[in-house]
Interface confidence: low
């Protein structure tokens, strides 16, 4: 079957849209009138109250839309709505760093139904966004290169459809945990893929299988750059007990949403924080998350590391290939940004059994104490570890070393760090030295060698 609409063209239920393994039911999308796609414009001039706009010259001209600015569309997912706080929060953070037309796309008319139907309705949403982009081009000479479409869950595939319909001319699409059911393993035509825009970046946060784990997001790579924070399956801070999950810092409603789909929603929270932390989400190219956590992917290669989220487009190698995979760790609550350091400690003093911790002090801030090693502390041995600091300390000025005994030792042994090397993710090294030793639980300050 096929249905046709004046503005948006025809939609069929032929393969691959329906009748394939991943979507066996022959279902057509609802009509544009029923999906009721709305465009809610926020700008630097109206950051708190949207202006509803349409693909119409008088509507655009009568709004705060500026043709000399980039335009970022934000598309929500299943059951969600365009007036939800998270979309406006993305816009508000954008206004802190740029002048931009920020358009929240509401399609709750089509998202609040069964999942299978909603997964078809995104075709209408994508067509509506494509129509809007093409209208801006024809009416105002506005280049699709200046358009960035950000889509969460089903919205990521709606963004892909918008990109496909504009022949890949859209500047950028960001997929925030693109939805898995009805999309994973399907042909590129149906889902978000790298040919949908000049640059496609993706954040995976809920990649466990939908059955039996209820992972709503794709594990499949679908962009030029695919980021897997915390491995892309289980996000820190999402395993709280029910009460603390629901009574959330952002309120009961956000807490209830988190309880239902915490990992899945983390993707847009990471993106929101990334806007105001331009270097706080460095993604490391690596074979797998296991290899990353084994400290085998540090520092960044000579070409640098891309930043997950808003600043991914600054990465020089962003379109060198498709399906480039990157790994990183984040915090367990906002601010989610983290800065990774490698610390190598060369010990001096007595041989004891215990553990050593180091804290960093720099021109931008100071870190907490992080454990570098636990076990036998032998003089002249060197121990290394990587950790993710919630503070960007900047250029290192000094480090502090402390050690703890694992067993009571009446001889009060002294241990020191003759040298500590701190390496930042860009490979910059800082060397600190001290000839001294200290008793356990006493801080030793090391200064540049």
């Amino acid at each position: 079957k096929e249905v046709c609409y004046e503005r948006l063209g025809c939609f069929s239920d032929d393969s691959p849209w329906s009748g394939i393994t991943e979507r066996p039911l022959h279902i057509l999308p609802w009509s544009p009138k029923d999906v009721n796609t709305r465009f809610l414009l926020y700008t630097n001039e109206n950051p708190n109250n949207f202006q509803e706009v349409a693909a119409d010259s008088s509507s655009i001209s009568g709004s705060n839309f500026k043709t000399n600015r980039k335009t970022r569309f934000i598309i929500h997912g299943f059951i969600d709505k365009g007036e939800e706080n998270w979309l406006a929060n993305v816009c508000k953070n954008l206004f802190k760093v740029e002048s931009v037309n920020c358009i929240c796309v509401d399609w709750k008319g089509g998202s609040r139904t069964g999942y299978t139907q909603a997964s078809q309705n995104i075709r209408i949403v994508g067509a509506e966004v494509a129509y809007f982009v093409e209208f801006l081009q024809s009416a105002f000479g506005y280049s699709p290169s200046n358009v960035h479409v950000i889509g969460h869950s089903l919205g990521a595939h709606a963004a892909g459809e918008a990109g496909r319909r504009t022949n890949g001319t859209i500047g950028r699409i960001t997929g925030l945990d693109p939805a898995e059911p009805c999309f994973q393993g399907t042909p590129e035509l149906v889902r978000l893929d790298p040919s949908d825009a000049k640059f496609v970046d993706v954040i995976h946060t809920d990649g466990a299988p939908i059955v039996p784990n209820l992972g709503f997001g794709m594990s499949q790579v679908v962009g030029h750059l695919d980021f897997f924070p915390n491995g892309g399956v289980e996000m820190p801070g999402c395993k709280k007990n029910i009460l603390s999950q629901i009574v959330d810092i952002d309120g009961i409603w956000e807490g209830t949403r988190d309880f239902a789909a915490c990992n899945h929603l983390r993707s847009y929270k990471y993106y929101t924080d990334s806007i105001v932390n331009p270097d706080g989400f460095a993604g490391f190219p690596c074979a797998s998350y296991n290899v990353f956590t084994a400290n085998k992917c540090f520092p960044c290669p000579s070409g640098g590391c891309p930043q997950m989220g808003h600043y991914a487009d600054r990465y020089p190698g962003k379109t060198n290939d498709v399906g480039q995979k990157f790994y990183l760790d984040t915090g367990d609550a906002s601010n989610f940004a983290r800065w990774r350091y490698k610390v190598s400690v060369t010990l001096s003093g007595k041989k004891v059994t215990g553990h050593i911790l180091v804290s960093l002090f720099g021109n931008k801030g100071n870190s907490k104490q992080y454990e570098i090693f636990k076990g036998t502390l032998k003089p002249d041995s060197t121990h290394s570890n990587e950790f993710d600091s919630d503070v960007d300390v900047g250029d290192l000025q000094m480090v502090k070393f402390i050690w703890y005994n694992n067993v009571i030792n009446p001889t009060l042994p002294r241990v020191g760090a003759s040298k500590i090397i701190v390496e930042t993710n860009v490979g910059k090294q800082f060397n600190f030295c001290s000839p001294e030793t200290v008793r356990e639980e006493v801080l030793l300050t090391l200064t540049p060698c």
């Epitope: 280049s143 200046n146 022949n167 890949g168 001319t169 040919s195 640059f199 498709v322």
Partner: nanobody, 121 residues
């Protein structure tokens, strides 16, 4: 198959101006960065100016304030306006673009044949 065709080179007096054009043709999906490079005999090809699809530009120090790069995305064309030309600007000027052919996912680096700019004193 994607081609780049430069035009606008020639002989000009020191202090004069020239405008180079480079048009991309063929099966183009999209173009990311476009730019101009130049090469003198026995030397490496050096970047002169680049412009990204969003409009951000980058210039070699030696041409800042004298050369202006611009681009027409609808025509898949990049321009280099060269003012206050100096004899040391004499070189073969090459157009460069990162092009994603239609219905593919990877960008390819494409070069033009080059156009000679001669600045006489």
């Amino acid at each position: 198959q994607v081609q780049l065709q430069e035009s606008g080179g020639g002989l000009v007096q020191a202090g004069g101006s020239l405008r180079l054009s480079c048009a991309a043709s063929g099966s183009i999906g999209s173009i990311h960065t476009m730019g101009w490079y130049r090469q003198t005999p026995g030397k490496e090809r050096d970047v002169v100016a680049t412009i990204q699809d969003g409009g951000s530009t980058n210039y070699a120090d030696s041409v800042k304030g004298r050369f202006t790069i611009s681009r027409d995305n609808t025509l898949n064309t990049v321009y280099l306006q060269m003012n206050d030309l100096k004899p040391e600007d004499t070189a073969v000027y090459y157009c460069n673009a990162d092009v994603r052919p239609y219905r593919t996912s990877r960008y390819l680096e494409v070069w033009g044949q080059g156009t000679l700019v001669t600045v006489s004193s």
